[in-house]
Interface confidence: low
């Protein structure tokens, strides 16, 4: 592993990204550590404010974590010749608040992208598709990791955060080859209706630690390759028949449902019946009721129809709360 020793004398290599001269074979950007044997460049916790322009052409794994990049402009990684081998790009925790359209263009081998732990006030609809065409060239991305990218409330745009992320995921149908999508810890209240339909190759979907209340308008039907669906730590109250049937119809799926505030009333009967016979839910014996109070901590699998009642609806004159 070689450490960087270049200084400002390397300025000729810091011309505009697209026109920069090819880096020397053994060059390592300042504030980075490079290993040609591992095809890895790490520029980690160095408070970088922009992506180094003089990245070595051999780079396959690029870590730019723990920096202060703020903005990723269009062509942030465009080089001449291109970084044709770059397969895994980790930008987590780099204080990004804006990712513009075409930020990842000219990375023909990019399989894995991690933007986690960046407060993305603005994610362009064309961040991953690279163009505003209705059908774009397919992105090479196989794994997209977007955990905890929700900005603080005071930095949010007027439009919904869920909608902004969804627009980037579906634009140009570019992510049809995506196998893994992680969207944990984003305060999502809902999942926009059309997103999953545009991601037919998904094998792993992580929506854990959000605030999803219902999956009623979400369709999993076309996710025939889905192997893992993580819905732990949300605000789910019950799964209805349509959702249950869709999940049961997926040939390989494992669903994770721990730590949701299940409401064990008459509306839960179908889900309990399904849980007792399905092999789809991992750790289903751990699922417990949160409401109503009299049912708290009861194990869903131990319930029968007699346990699952709904209070009669009182006329308005008798309602006290």
């Amino acid at each position: 592993t070689s450490s960087a020793s270049s200084s400002s004398s390397s300025a000729p290599f810091l011309a505009s990204a697209a026109s920069a001269q090819p880096p020397l074979p053994d060059q390592c950007p300042a504030l980075c550590e490079c290993s040609e044997a591992a095809r890895t460049v790490k520029c980690v916790n160095r408070n970088l404010t922009e992506v180094p322009t003089d990245l070595p052409l051999y780079v396959r794994n690029l870590f730019l974590t723990g920096n202060q990049l703020a903005v990723l402009p269009a062509g942030a990684f465009a080089r001449r010749p291109p970084l044709a081998e770059l397969a895994a790009l980790n930008l987590s925790g780099s204080r990004l608040d804006e990712v513009r359209g075409g930020a990842f263009e000219h990375l023909p081998s990019l399989r894995q992208l991690d933007l986690s732990h960046n407060p993305l006030a603005y994610l362009s609809p064309f961040a991953f598709s690279g163009s505003n065409a209705s059908i774009s060239a397919p992105s090479p991305l196989v794994e997209l990791i977007l955990n905890h990218i929700v900005p603080p409330d005071d930095k949010r745009q007027n439009r919904s955060f869920e909608g902004m992320v969804a627009a980037a995921l579906v634009a140009g149908r570019a992510l049809q080859g995506l196998h893994l999508l992680e969207l944990a810890s984003n305060h999502f209240l809902y999942l926009p209706r059309d997103v999953l339909a545009q991601l037919p190759s998904l094998r792993y979907l992580d929506l854990s630690n959000n605030s999803l209340v219902s999956l009623t308008y979400v369709s999993f039907r076309n996710l025939t390759h889905l192997e893992s669906l993580h819905l732990e730590d949300n605000a789910l109250k019950v799964l209805h028949n349509g959702t249950l049937a869709e999940l049961q119809g997926l040939p390989h799926v494992r669903v994770f449902l721990d730590n949701n505030p299940w409401v064990c009333d008459c509306h839960m009967a179908d889900m309990v019946t399904w849980l007792k016979q399905t092999g789809v839910v991992q750790g289903k014996d751990r699922l417990t009721c949160a409401f109503p109070e009299k049912m708290r901590n009861r194990v869903l699998l131990e319930l029968n129809s007699a346990d699952l009642d709904c209070d009669p609806i009182l006329p308005p004159s008798l309602q006290t709360s």
Partner: antibody
Framework: DVQLVESGGGLVQPGGSRKLSCTAS????????MHWVRQAPETGLEWVAY????????YYADSVKGRFTISRDNPKNTLFLQMTSLRSEDTAMYFC?????????????WGQGTTLTVSS | DIVLTQSPASLAVSLGQRATISCRAS??????????MHWYQQKPGQPPKLLIK???NLESGVPARFSGSGSGTDFTLNIHPVEEEDTATYYC?????????FGGGTKLEIK
């Protein structure tokens, strides 16, 4: 059904060469990275080499670097391991295996293996 | 290179009981969101078979009595309840970096 069938093993003298083949069927070979893994008699598993789906990336274990070359012929659904300067410690069962994605997943299908014996 | 140390080297478990196998890595093989550790089963005369990928994800077709857990440097494979057909050698393997390495193996015998 996914199938991987290795061939080319046998008895080789120290210093000699051998080329192993692995023929794939039942899946789109050109979409998968491929590995060679070996297992010496009565011992554990040792990863040997990897080649990416489009042959742009190669990795080797230090123990074989400079002596072994991994390659593939996607139209023919075949993976190769060219071995030169063979040593007695290269004696092992050689398995080919596929990996579905860069990095994250395990080796999800393996062939039955072919035995290489390096001895005079 | 990352060294994977499995323990115990062998164990004998009564039918229907729990078998627990540990794997310790010489450095972390987990990112903030994922673990690059996998478990395999190998029976005599057969190739290894993937059981668990990425620490805890059961491979399609593998019985639910197999489960995996752990992150960072410490990982565990559990089999419960153990069945006769689980007699085999079990290996952990990381894919954090090149070279991939395997643990030394744990031989499981059913009493």
């Amino acid at each position: 059904d996914v199938q991987l069938v290795e061939s080319g093993g046998g008895l080789v003298q120290p210093g000699g060469s051998r080329k192993l083949s692995c023929t794939a069927s039942g899946f789109t070979f050109s979409n998968f990275g491929m590995h060679w893994v070996r297992q010496a008699p009565e011992t554990g598993l040792e990863w040997v080499a990897y080649i990416s789906s489009g042959s742009s990336t190669f990795y080797y274990a230090d123990s074989v670097k400079g002596r072994f070359t991994i390659s593939r012929d996607n139209p023919k659904n075949t993976l190769f391991l060219q071995m030169t300067s063979l040593r007695s410690e290269d004696t092992a069962m050689y398995f080919c295996a596929r990996s579905p994605a860069y990095y994250r997943y395990g080796l999800d299908y393996w062939g039955q293996g072919t035995t290489l014996t390096v001895s005079s | 290179d990352i060294v994977l140390t499995q323990s115990p080297a062998s164990l004998a478990v009564s039918l229907g009981q729990r078998a627990t196998i540990s794997c310790r890595a010489s450095q972390s093989v987990s990112s903030s969101t994922f673990s690059y550790m996998h478990w395999y089963q190998q029976k005599p005369g057969q190739p290894p078979k993937l059981l668990i990928k990425s620490s805890s994800n059961l491979e399609s077709g593998v019985p639910a009595r197999f489960s995996g857990s752990g992150s960072g440097t410490d990982f565990t494979l559990n089999i419960h309840p153990v069945e006769e057909e689980d007699t085999a050698t079990y290996y952990c393997q990381h894919s954090w970096e090149i070279p991939y390495t395997f643990g030394g193996g744990t031989k499981l015998e059913i009493k």
